[in-house]
Interface confidence: medium
């Protein structure tokens, strides 16, 4: 599923991401935009043999199990395919674990490069939330 901007903002808010670990909803929507272009089925392969999955491009070396990433830790204890569902529950729950890990949203390269320090509230402007 490819979410609309406000549709995703509403879903993320419903799942408790607004101000989760101090990160406003705009940060999460911005991250999703530049990680996956709001596409729940996005997959991207990395040079280390791992793959990023879903709307927040969660990595198989650390966070989920895709059955083929050497040394996978699967810290979210889920199959990576669960992160590709049109229901974003699994992605949100895993993202909460990631953002609580110590580096905050710096874990997402796209957030670091495209969202951090910008007017992230623009990503939820005009949305009925």
């Amino acid at each position: 599923k490819v979410f609309g901007r406000c549709e995703l903002a509403a879903a993320m808010k419903r799942h408790g991401l607004d101000n989760y670990r101090g990160y406003s909803l705009g940060n999460w929507v911005c991250a999703a935009k530049f990680e996956s272009n709001f596409n729940t089925q996005a997959t991207n392969r990395n040079t280390d043999g791992s793959t990023d999955y879903g709307i927040l491009q969660i990595n198989s070396r650390w966070w989920c199990n895709d059955g083929r990433t050497p040394g996978s830790r699967n810290l979210c204890n889920i199959p990576c395919s669960a992160l590709l569902s049109s229901d974003i529950t699994a992605s949100v729950n895993c993202a909460k674990k990631i953002v609580s890990d110590g580096n905050g949203m710096n874990a997402w390269v796209a957030w670091r490069n495209r969202c951090k320090g910008t007017d992230v509230q623009a990503w939820i402007r005009g949305c009925r939330l």
Epitope: Q41, R68, L84
Partner: antibody, heavy 116, light 107 residues
Framework: QVQLQESGAEVMKPGASVKISCKAT????????IEWVKQRPGHGLEWIGE????????YYNEKFKGKATFTADTSSNTAYMQLSSLTSEDSAVYYC?????????WGQGTTLTVSS | DIELTQSPATLSVTPGDSVSLSCRAS??????LHWYQQKPHESPRLLIK???QRASGIPSRFSGSGSGTDFTLSINSVETEDFGMYFC?????????FGGGTKLEIK
């Protein structure tokens, strides 16, 4: 136990298309990548590409882009590979395998012969 | 693409001999190297994963070693059922690639 059952041998004319199937049993089909591999005598094994059935995400070896197309039907736990514009170079045995990085589980292979 | 070069192309041995098969990668692939055996008209069978881990049900006479670019499959005291083709495969990057194979034949 994990099993991959491929469709039977095919004899096709040059220029035609063929669709090979790979039915998976014994594991959660949507969770693992299905890989496709080509084997021709004297050419060893070649990786064609892969599909994640749960999402339909696909990756192709550049060499096979435009030649192979992957699909999957999660209701029947079956992956498909269509090969188009067949030539004699496509005559080979085609395997599906479960993508664990390594390939512990293979189909029995589908022999494709392209001949006029 | 990562090239895998296997040597020798053919190895003629007598049952009871011990042999080593080589697989060399064109660039470092850490331990992401796997070995397969294939008999005529059969699918490949996984022997060794991640350079040195024996796959389920594989006899202890098969062992693997190496890291980076140089890898070895060793068969201690070859048995008649071991004859066939041996392939290596890398999963360090895409596209996945295979070696050209080593044929193990009876002398």
């Amino acid at each position: 136990q994990v099993q991959l059952q491929e469709s039977g041998a095919e004899v096709m004319k040059p220029g035609a298309s063929v669709k090979i199937s790979c039915k998976a049993t014994g594991y959660t089909f949507t969770t693992y990548w299905i890989e496709w591999v080509k084997q021709r005598p004297g050419h060893g094994l070649e990786w064609i590409g892969e599909i994640l059935p749960g999402s339909g995400s696909t990756y192709y070896n550049e060499k096979f882009k435009g030649k192979a197309t992957f699909t999957a039907d999660t209701s029947s736990n079956t992956a498909y590979m269509q090969l188009s514009s067949l030539t004699s170079e496509d005559s080979a045995v085609y395997y599906c395998a479960r993508g664990d990085g390594f390939y512990c589980y293979w189909g029995q292979g589908t022999t494709l012969t392209v001949s006029s | 693409d990562i090239e895998l070069t296997q040597s020798p192309a053919t190895l003629s041995v007598t049952p009871g001999d011990s042999v080593s098969l080589s697989c060399r990668a064109s660039q470092s692939i850490s331990n992401n190297l796997h070995w397969y055996q294939q008999k005529p008209h059969e699918s490949p069978r996984l022997l060794i994963k991640y350079a040195s881990q024996r796959a389920s049900g594989i006899p202890s006479r098969f062992s693997g070693s190496g890291s980076g670019t140089d890898f070895t499959l060793s068969i201690n005291s070859v048995e008649t059922e071991d004859f066939g083709m041996y392939f290596c495969q890398q999963s360090n990057s895409w596209p996945r690639t295979f070696g050209g194979g080593t044929k193990l034949e009876i002398k």
